[in-house]
Every structure is written in structure tokens, then in C-alpha cells.
Interface confidence: medium
């Protein structure tokens, strides 16, 4: 376990022409805050992928109002470090994402408005316990200067915070909940003097006078076991001075609940009971209230009457997510009827309607036949948002204005000859065929139900039906 720490030194317009004077230009007062997100590994992950190693939000910075005549000063920044606790081993390689957000404090409908000013994403290698690393990054016209480090929290030590540090005087038995125990290091610096009576086995301290408990132990002096299991007396592999095992891997092994949450097993999974001020599947989300301004993109934060109540972000159209952080693909809701094309213009949706439809959502089916007479006795048929003329015999074209040759489509079957006639067409059939279109074979023996030849045979083939 340990903490990733980020210190923002400055954020402001980068060098060069065209850089903005300040983030508040012509917008009235504003203030900045930062969000840090840590993702494991060096892969280029999607921006939406979760901050699996953790995330943190800074406090709001002081309110800043631009003075048009004055030279642009360094922007006032939030005080303090951004700290991202990590429970497991420090991965060494990680992606660091730092977002700079602007909170506009002018008269906004629904409260302050938030917008993302800059995002820098860098893949980094960093050993825990090392010195502060300094960096300067550009994001568009902005420049961000910052330092960062990862440090282990005792009793964890080492470049990945995986070794457990034991003061020379402490016994070498591991506490419950470690499976198997990490090797204990004897070469640790002398710890500070802990609170009087703090358990040497189950407690430790970083500051003089405190008593912090190892997993599995609680109480002011870390004397009270959280669960009844311990390494002693368990069946299975024997305990040694360097390690011990607890039975089988269970969902609560290693306590997946962060921030002091307690884990209880459920069928096939686990459930964390979080202390007040934290929530989430693993108690990983710190207690945020409306005062922290958690709703982005102009979302309205509605909070309960007391701190125990949840807050909720009501997002304006176009945004969603628990903090209104995601842009909605509003066209995915298919708001345009009758095959209209949806256009999301940001401030509004627009539907481009197919011919024959109108209205904001293409909901009105126009009377396609109105004023569209079909010539030469044709009748107008509506359908699919377009009109169509069903033409009288001898005429064709979109409006039945073209004289049609009824014989052009060769309507007479089996070699019959077609003659155009004022009322349509007449077929003169070849010998052996009959019907208006010469479609029926004539059989002198009267067996008209049989085909002229078996399937696949030509009439001249020797096989015959009997």
C-alpha cells in the first residue's frame, strides 16, 4: 500500500503567440481545480477506461477575475497535494492523466458551469520511494508544471511497496489476512515511537504517538482482531517465521475494500461496508457533496438534507453519467421519425427529413398527392413519403405523361407475338400455347395439368410421360 502524490506548481498560458491571457477571459470570475487519474501499464487506453489505480480531485483554487489592463499573472492554484492512495503493489509503469478544469462563477442557469481546459496524458515509469519527478507538459495553448512521486506507507517498503518492514525488535510472525506473508525486511530504519501500548505485532506508526493497524486488526491499540481467523492453528501448510497461509482464496482475501471498509462475502462475490464519507463497490469513492461541485457540464447538483444523504447530478440534455461527464449521443435515441437523418448540433438536435415528411422530428407525413395530378387518367398513390402514379394502359413515366409501348416489355410468353391496341395489348400465341399472355401449353390429349416435359428435360428428349 502507498500513496501517489502530485503537486501542481503552475498552470497558465504557454509561450508563443496566440496563447490565451487567462482561462477566465471575458467570462467573469472563475477558479481552477485539477483531477488526476492513474491507469496501470503503458498501453494507450481509451480516455473513458476507468482510473484503475485511482483518481483524485483537488480542492477549488481561489477565485480569479481577469484585470484586462494588468499583465497576466500566474493563475491562483488550489492548495495542497493531490493524493491517490493505492492498496496493492505499485506497478512501476503507469499512465498519468492530469485534467485542468475551469469553474465559471458568473450567473449560470443551474449554478456554476464546468469545462475541461486541458488534459495531459503521459506514460511513465516510476519506482516507489524515489525522489520527486518534475515535469512540464503542454496541452494546446496551456502549460502545466508539476511534480509527482509514489511513496509506500509503512509497513510496506521497496520500489513496489510489496515488502513489509519489521523493526528489528518485532517478532517475525505475520498477522492474519496475509496469504502468504511477504518476506519481512530487517534492514528498515528505526520506526518512530508509537502511542504507548500500541501492539508491536499488529500496529505501526508513521508519526510519533499514532497507532495504525495492520489489516485484520482494529482498536485504538490494534489489539482487537477484525475476524477470528489467524495464522495459528489453521489446517493446511504449516506456519513459518517468514510466512503463513490462510485457508483457500476467498473473495475477501486481502480485503478489497478501500478506505477502511469492511468486507463480507456474498455468493460468488463480496460486499464492502464503507465508513461514512466513502462509497462505491470497493469504498474507493470519497464522500463528495454538492459543495465539492461534482457535476460537470452545467449539471445541477441536488444534495440531501444531511451529509449522510447521497447527492445526484441532474444533467442537461446532451450529457449523462453520474457526474454529467459523458456526452450523450443523442442521435442514438433515434429521435427522427420516418427515416429522417439526425444531426446533433450541440445546442440542439436537427432532423433532416426524407421527401414527403416534415416537422421538427419528421413526424408529419405530407400529402404527397396534393397538387400532383397524374396525367392521362393515372391515379396517385401515396407511400413511403413519396407519391407515385399508377398509370392507365398505354401511358408511363413519373406523371403518366409519356406514351408507353405496351409491347416493349415483351409480355407474350412462349414466342407469342404482341400487338398494341387502343385498350392495351393483344398476344397472338405460337402453336401449342394459349392464354392472354400465351402462358398455358395446350395438350391435345387433354392432360393439361402436366408440364410439357419433366423438370430438366427438353421437349425433344426421348423420355416421355406415360
Amino acid at each position: 500500500a502507498g500513496v501517489f502524490e502530485l503537486q501542481i506548481h503552475s498552470f497558465g498560458p504557454g509561450p508563443g503567440p496566440g496563447a490565451p491571457r487567462s482561462p477566465c477571459s471575458a467570462r467573469g470570475p472563475c477558479r481552477l481545480f485539477f483531477r488526476v487519474c492513474l491507469k496501470p501499464g503503458l498501453s494507450e487506453e481509451a480516455a473513458e477506461s476507468p482510473c484503475a489505480l485511482g483518481a483524485a480531485l483537488s480542492a477549488r483554487g481561489p477565485v480569479y477575475t481577469e484585470q484586462p489592463e494588468a499583465p497576466a499573472p500566474d493563475l491562483p492554484l488550489p492548495n495542497g497535494l493531490l493524493q491517490v492512495p493505492f492498496r496493492d503493489a505499485w506497478p512501476g509503469t503507469f499512465s498519468l492523466i492530469i485534467e485542468t478544469w475551469r469553474e465559471e462563477l458568473g450567473d449560470q442557469i443551474g449554478g456554476p458551469a464546468w469545462s475541461l481546459l486541458a488534459r495531459v496524458t503521459r506514460r511513465r515509469r516510476l519506482a516507489a520511494g524515489g525522489p520527486w519527478a518534475r515535469d512540464i507538459q503542454r496541452a494546446g495553448a496551456w502549460e502545466l508544471r508539476f511534480s509527482y512521486r509514489a511513496r509506500c506507507e509503512l509497513p510496506a517498503v521497496g520500489t513496489a511497496c510489496t515488502r513489509l518492514c519489521r523493526p528489528r525488535s518485532a517478532p517475525s510472525r505475520c498477522g492474519p489476512g496475509l496469504r502468504p506473508c511477504a518476506p519481512l525486511e530487517d534492514e528498515c530504519e528505526a520506526p518512530p515511537v508509537c502511542r504507548a501500548g500500541c501492539s508491536l505485532e499488529h500496529g505501526f506508526c508513521e508519526q510519533p504517538g499514532e497507532c495504525r493497524c495492520l489489516e485484520g486488526w482494529t482498536g485504538p491499540l490494534c489489539m482487537v482482531p477484525v475476524s477470528t481467523s489467524s495464522c495459528l492453528g489453521l489446517r493446511g501448510p504449516s506456519s513459518t517465521t517468514t510466512g503463513c497461509l490462510v485457508p483457500g482464496p476467498g473473495p475477501c482475501d486481502g480485503n478489497p475494500c478501500a478506505n477502511g471498509g469492511s468486507c463480507s462475502e456474498t455468493p460468488g462475490s463480496f460486499e464492502c461496508t464503507c465508513p461514512r464519507g466513502f462509497y462505491g463497490l470497493r469504498c474507493e469513492v470519497s464522500g463528495v457533496t454538492c459543495a465539492d461541485g461534482p457535476c460537470f457540464n452545467g449539471g445541477l447538483c441536488v444534495g440531501g438534507a444531511d451529509p449522510d444523504s447521497a447527492y445526484i447530478c441532474h444533467c442537461p440534455p446532451g450529457f449523462q453519467g453520474s457526474n454529467c461527464e459523458k456526452r450523450v449521443d443523442r442521435c442514438s435515441l433515434q429521435p427522427c421519425r420516418n427515416g429522417g437523418l439526425c444531426l446533433d448540433l450541440g445546442h440542439a438536435l436537427r432532423c433532416r427529413c426524407r421527401a414527403g415528411f416534415a416537422g421538427p422530428r419528421c413526424e408529419h407525413d405530407l400529402d404527397d398527392c396534393a397538387g400532383r395530378a397524374c396525367a392521362n387518367g393515372g391515379t396517385c398513390v401515396e407511400g413511403g413519403g413519396a407519391h407515385r402514379c399508377s398509370c392507365a394502359l398505354g401511358f408511363g413515366g413519373r406523371n403518366c405523361r409519356e406514351r408507353a409501348d405496351p409491347c416493349a416489355a415483351r409480355p407474350c410468353a412462349h414466342g407469342g407475338r404482341c400487338y398494341a391496341h387502343f385498350s392495351g395489348l393483344v398476344c397472338a400465341c405460337a402453336p401449342g400455347y394459349m392464354g392472354a399472355r400465351c402462358e398455358f401449353p395446350v395438350h391435345p390429349d387433354g392432360v393439361s395439368a402436366l408440364p410439357a416435359a419433366p423438370p430438366g428435360l427438353r421437349p425433344g428428349d426421348p423420355q416421355r410421360y406415360l
Epitope: 445541477l300 441536488v302 440531501g304 444533467c315 449523462q320
Partner: antibody, heavy 118, light 107 residues
């Protein structure tokens, strides 16, 4: 399609408790807040509270804080509301409703009619 | 709590009519208002969210408008299936509150 199934009716005695269920299907149950709304006979709608299945967060109308307890069972995608110390004032239809991503109660259950009578 | 008032508790109109139902809030609610329809069998459906956005599947004859404290729902061409009680609901502040409802009947 999104469906919220509620039992049709419950008959309970004064002073007792009743646990109403709302089984969700057709969407990711753990991603949406679930609301509960009360409607007394011939009257309007009253918001009781809401619960988020993943976060476990709840928010109650102050008026119902000592009357209603909201819980969920994620494994069965079911939301529950327990009403305690029932009186005739609690005789009503109780609806569950999903809170859509744009802050509207976009799908409603059919409602459970609770009658408190000795 | 924010009080939502629907001054007209019942309203009678003819088929094909244009009907407007109004709703006022005891304080400004910045367009955070939804409209619901409750049919005689008790079924409740969302019609309009965020003052004027039509919920998917709702006929285009329904529309909403308003700002500040005053809002309205309009049915442009009344049809038989529109017989119902219509409720407005604010979500600007907890607790969420509904109007008393407007019962729409056919003349």
C-alpha cells in the same frame, strides 16, 4: 425492453410492516437510481426516496424517513421498500420508477396497492 | 420544499382540440421539470423531460414549454387515448415534488 414488475396488492394489519418488491429487467439494474412514489386513493403522487443499487446510496423525502427503508438485491435485480408501523394513512398505491440518464423517471412499475386494515 | 401547483384540477375538451395544461413552482426551478401521464388503469408514463424534450415513443402532438416558475404541457390535437391525469414534477431540489394533477376528459 425495460420492465419493472410489482405485485398487484398487499393486505396488512395496522402496526405491521410490509416489504414491497420491484423486479427490474431489460436494462443494467446496477447503473440506475430506483425511485419509489406513493399515491393515496384519489390523490396525487408523492416522492418517497431513491436508492442506487451499486453505490448503496439512498436519499429520502424527510417525511418518509422513519416510515420507509429502501434496499436492493443486486443478484436478482430487485429493489425493495419496507414500510413499518403501518396505519390507514399508509393505504395507497406504491410505484417504483427508474431514474433515466437525463433525470426523468422514464419507466414505471404498475404499482402495488397496499391496504392497511384489521 | 418546492410546491408545484396545477391550478386546473380537471379539464374537458373535444377531440381534435388544442389543450394546454399549466404548472407553476413556488420558486424558480431552471427548467428542471418533467411531465407524466397517468391512465385510468393507473399506468404512469413519462411524456416530457427537462421542460420540453419529448421522451422516445411519445407522439409529437405532446410538447412542453416554460421557464422560471411557469411551465405548460400542450396537446395539439386531442385524441381519445389522451384521457388521463397529467402531472408535472420538479427535480431542482430534494425532495422531488409533483403537482396535484390535471384530469383531462373528452366532452
Amino acid at each position: 425492453q425495460v420492465q419493472l414488475q410489482q405485485p398487484g396488492a398487499e393486505l396488512v394489519k395496522p402496526g405491521a410492516s410490509v416489504k414491497l418488491s420491484c423486479k427490474a429487467s431489460g436494462y443494467s439494474f446496477t447503473s440506475y437510481w430506483m425511485h419509489w412514489v406513493k399515491q393515496r386513493p384519489g390523490q396525487g403522487l408523492e416522492w418517497i426516496g431513491m436508492i442506487h443499487p451499486t453505490l448503496g446510496d439512498t436519499n429520502y423525502n424527510e417525511k418518509f424517513k422513519s416510515k420507509a427503508t429502501l434496499t436492493v438485491d443486486k443478484s436478482s435485480s430487485t429493489a425493495y421498500m419496507e414500510l413499518s408501523s403501518l396505519t390507514s394513512e399508509d393505504s395507497a398505491v406504491y410505484y417504483c420508477a427508474r431514474l433515466g440518464s437525463l433525470s426523468m423517471m422514464d419507466y414505471w412499475g404498475q404499482g402495488t396497492s397496499v391496504t392497511v386494515s384489521s | 420544499d418546492i410546491q408545484m401547483t396545477q391550478t386546473t384540477s380537471s379539464l374537458s375538451a373535444s377531440l381534435g382540440d388544442r389543450v394546454t395544461i399549466s404548472c407553476s413552482a413556488s420558486q424558480g426551478i431552471s427548467n428542471y421539470l418533467n411531465w407524466y401521464q397517468q391512465k385510468p388503469d393507473g399506468t404512469v408514463k413519462l411524456l416530457i423531460y427537462y421542460t420540453s424534450s419529448l421522451h422516445s415513443g411519445v407522439p409529437a402532438r405532446f410538447s412542453g414549454s416554460g421557464s422560471g416558475t411557469d411551465y405548460s404541457l400542450t396537446i395539439s390535437n386531442l385524441e381519445p387515448e389522451d384521457i388521463a391525469i397529467y402531472y408535472c414534477q420538479q427535480y431542482s431540489k430534494f425532495p422531488y415534488t409533483f403537482g396535484g394533477g390535471t384530469k383531462l376528459e373528452i366532452k
